[in-house]
């Protein structure tokens, strides 16, 4: 049994790190493999992750981690029974993929404005909470040529768009994703999209 592609891991910087790797041939990951991980820190304990299959030769493991902070470094040992297949380390703060924002809501009852709000995916005591910025993607299924990205670089998870900048009488969709500048993260996955109908009409000119 051999590792073809070594494990690579990303952390949500809250509670879960996801490691993926490929084996040299078809493998029943959960039955044949174990990924052991331990924080390099006093009084830390060794934890075991049971991987799942991810395609024929691929495996994925979801490592549970508490109170993830920048100095954390984990040792990783991939075992097949008594055989050590691979040994490595993982520093979560250097491989962060934020959680996706949630609860994206569109408020169209605000005068002349489409207001989009969403929730920060982290609790206030998490270190990413005050570091997230967002990208909001708005597009129309009725108008395939229309797709815009709005960068939200302030902390408040809201975006206001003048209704007049959107075509009247057609439906739009929006989705949002996040990243954390000071942690040099990748972008999160997109949130589920939400749909609304733009009924705004320009007032008659006098």
């Amino acid at each position: 049994m051999k590792v073809l592609q070594e494990p690579t891991c990303v952390s949500d910087y809250m509670s879960i790190s996801t490691c993926e790797w490929k084996m040299g041939g078809p493998t029943n990951c959960s039955a044949e493999l174990r990924l052991l991980y331990q924080l390099v820190f006093q009084s830390s304990e060794t934890h075991t992750c049971v991987p799942e299959n991810n395609g024929g030769v691929g495996c994925v493991c979801h490592l549970l981690m508490d109170d993830v902070v920048s100095m954390d470094n984990y040792t990783l040992d991939l075992w097949a029974g008594q055989q050590l297949l691979w040994k490595g380390s993982f520093k979560p703060s250097e491989h962060v993929k934020p959680r996706a924002p949630g609860n994206l809501t569109v408020h169209t009852n605000v005068s002349d404005t489409v207001l989009l709000t969403w929730s920060n995916p982290y609790p206030p005591d998490n270190y990413l909470y005050n570091d997230l910025t967002y990208a909001v993607n708005i597009w129309s299924e009725n108008d395939p040529a229309y797709s815009r990205i709005h960068n939200v670089t302030y902390l408040k998870p809201t975006l206001r768009i003048p209704a007049s900048t959107l075509k009247s009488g057609i439906s739009y969709r929006a989705r949002v994703r996040a990243w954390a500048q000071h942690y040099n993260t990748t972008w999160s996955e997109w949130s589920p999209s939400t749909k609304w109908y733009n009924s705004y009409r320009e007032p008659f000119e006098q």
Epitope: V40, F41, Q42, S43, S44, E45, D66, D67, V69, S70, M71, D72, D125
Partner: antibody
Framework: QVQLVQSGAEVKKPGASVKVSCKAS????????MHWARQAPGQGLEWMGI????????SYAQKFQGRVTMTRDTSTSTVYMELSSLRSEDTAVYYC?????????WGKGTLVTVSS | QSVLTQPPSVSAAPGQKVTISCSGG????????VSWYQQLPGTAPKLLIY???KRPSGIPDRFSGSKSGTSATLAITGLQTGDEADYYC????????????FGTGTKLTVL
Amino acid sequence: QVQLVQSGAEVKKPGASVKVSCKASGYAFTSYYMHWARQAPGQGLEWMGIINPSGGSTSYAQKFQGRVTMTRDTSTSTVYMELSSLRSEDTAVYYCARGKWWWQYWGKGTLVTVSS
Amino acid sequence: QSVLTQPPSVSAAPGQKVTISCSGGSSNIGNSYVSWYQQLPGTAPKLLIYDNNKRPSGIPDRFSGSKSGTSATLAITGLQTGDEADYYCGTWDTSTTYHPIFGTGTKLTVL
């Protein structure tokens, strides 16, 4: 909100033991390490040791090895620090503090006075 | 015995800027992150800075931290009378199994 509530002040005789408690609330108790530190009157901070509430494993400063014992009770979300063979130099305020590499939440402190 | 050295005291007038240094070595500050704590009279320490230069939520941006080599610095701008306190730096001794160590402490007086 996160709270660490420590037991009240103690007066002990030299040679005795003291057990200080720190009750945690407002968060998942087993998810965060707990440190103990002390501060003698007019002096600086001195680290004593750490306990991992998840499994109960500990690590102590060399100075306190053999004299300090840290335990936890997950049913009450409480950690304990017991210091034995007390001497006058152990008179200090004892703090519990939550965290790993730095400590964002502290108890208010417990004054332990060792006097004959 | 602390191996992180801080000046025993510093002072400045309200509105001024003050810096507090913390000097260590390659087995601690030089190979680790630094945090800073403020201890107001009769109270427990409070985290001001972690990861050398990051502020927890609720800490005003008048407080900033930096690190260079084996030394770290806490800067406080726009001094207020409420800033009068003891300040401690903290880091980790990487020559042991990552045991924390604190600085000797600095008493800040706002004149």
